[in-house]
Amino acid sequence: CKAMHVAQPAVVLASSRGIASFVCEYASPGKATEVRVTVLRQADSQVTEVCAATYMMGNELTFLDDSICTGTSSGNQVNLTIQGLRAMDTGLYICKVELMYPPPYYLGIGNGTQIYVIDPEPCPDSDF
């Protein structure tokens, strides 16, 4: 069966500092040496690319310098962290995994992680 399944948590709550972390795990049907991981955000039927990184198996996952994502990889598991999130960024974050090399190419798309972001209440001014 030519299948690559991707698993990710259903729901994650971002921290008060606007940081959300989740694991994206894939069952690889082949021995890939080059893997691309993309985080897609789906909200109101609009899909946008949040970030993407290509890594060589055994090496670290590196996103672009201006990316809001960071991550680490271990085997067929990627630990993703998205920062700078605000309430308006609440939505479904989908993990897409592509086995880029060697051939054949395989695609795997997770069901998505619903990330809830709650903006912190501003601290009331204190009079001393």
């Epitope: 030519k2 690559m4 897609l40 690319e49 290509t54 897409k96 190419y105 695609l107 798309i109």
Partner: antibody, heavy 119, light 108 residues
Framework: QVQLVESGGGVVQPGRSLRLSCAAS????????MHWVRQAPGKGLEWVAV????????YYVDSVKGRFTISRDNSNNTLYLQMNSLRAEDTAVYYC????????????WGQGTLVTVSS | EIVLTQSPGTLSLSPGEGATLSCRAS???????LAWYQQKPGQAPRLLIY???SRATGIPDRFSGSGSGTDFTLTISRLEPEDFAVYYC?????????FGPGTKVDIK
């Protein structure tokens, strides 16, 4: 809006070469896989080649391996197909098509350019 | 390589009738990564369905897709005059990406 415009088709003799171009606009070109799909006269669709993102990874259908080369210029939003050692069976309309965020299916296609290989 | 077989080769129907088109894969592939296209003479194909069952933007709800594993179906609930065309399925779970040979839906 997304636009894909192919050019470079024409009549060429067997064994000769031709280079097709596809000018893309209306989207972030480097974020998508780009493909060539062909259709011989009166026949079905045949996927030919794909090139991903930064251009390092390329795959081809077996029948064109070693003869065709797909490439892209992300700074100019242009996709290319260099076709060498052309054969009569390469005669077809060649479409450039964009992959999607959710996989390599094709939501946008060019109008197609006809390549005729004949002596 | 995953080979896709479509049946029937030609379907002769009248406007208002329903159409059921089949696409069968030579082996099971990733998570229903199957698309359907419509093509009219002299035009580029138009995406109808992806992910086996998700309608593409702007596609009328008389078009629906279903199936999983190796067997997939495109259903057109009530044929409109503009629906008479050739329909192709395509798998995109693994390379090489492959199309079925097509089903022609023509007017009876």
């Amino acid at each position: 809006q997304v636009q894909l415009v192919e050019s470079g088709g024409g009549v060429v003799q067997p064994g000769r070469s031709l280079r097709l171009s596809c000018a893309a606009s209306g989207f972030t070109f480097s974020s998508f896989g780009m493909h060539w799909v062909r259709q011989a006269p009166g026949k079905g669709l045949e996927w030919v080649a794909v090139i991903w993102y930064d251009g390092r990874n390329k795959y081809y259908v077996d029948s064109v391996k070693g003869r065709f080369t797909i490439s892209r210029d992300n700074s100019n939003n242009t996709l290319y197909l260099q076709m060498n050692s052309l054969r009569a069976e390469d005669t077809a309309v060649y479409y450039c098509a964009r992959g999607e965020f959710f996989g390599e299916f094709f939501d946008y296609w060019g109008q197609g350019t006809l390549v005729t290989v004949s002596s | 390589e995953i080979v896709l077989t479509q049946s029937p080769g030609t379907l002769s129907l009248s406007p208002g009738e329903g159409a059921t088109l089949s696409c069968r894969a030579s082996q099971s592939f990733s998570s229903n990564y199957l698309a359907w296209y419509q093509q009219k003479p002299g035009q580029a194909p138009r995406l109808l369905i992806y992910g086996a069952s998700s309608r593409a933007t702007g596609i009328p709800d008389r078009f629906s897709g279903s199936g999983s594993g190796t067997d997939f179906t495109l259903t057109i609930s009530r044929l409109e005059p503009e629906d008479f065309a050739v329909y192709y399925c395509q798998q995109y779970g693994t390379s090489p990406f492959t199309f079925g040979p097509g089903t022609k839906v023509d007017i009876k």
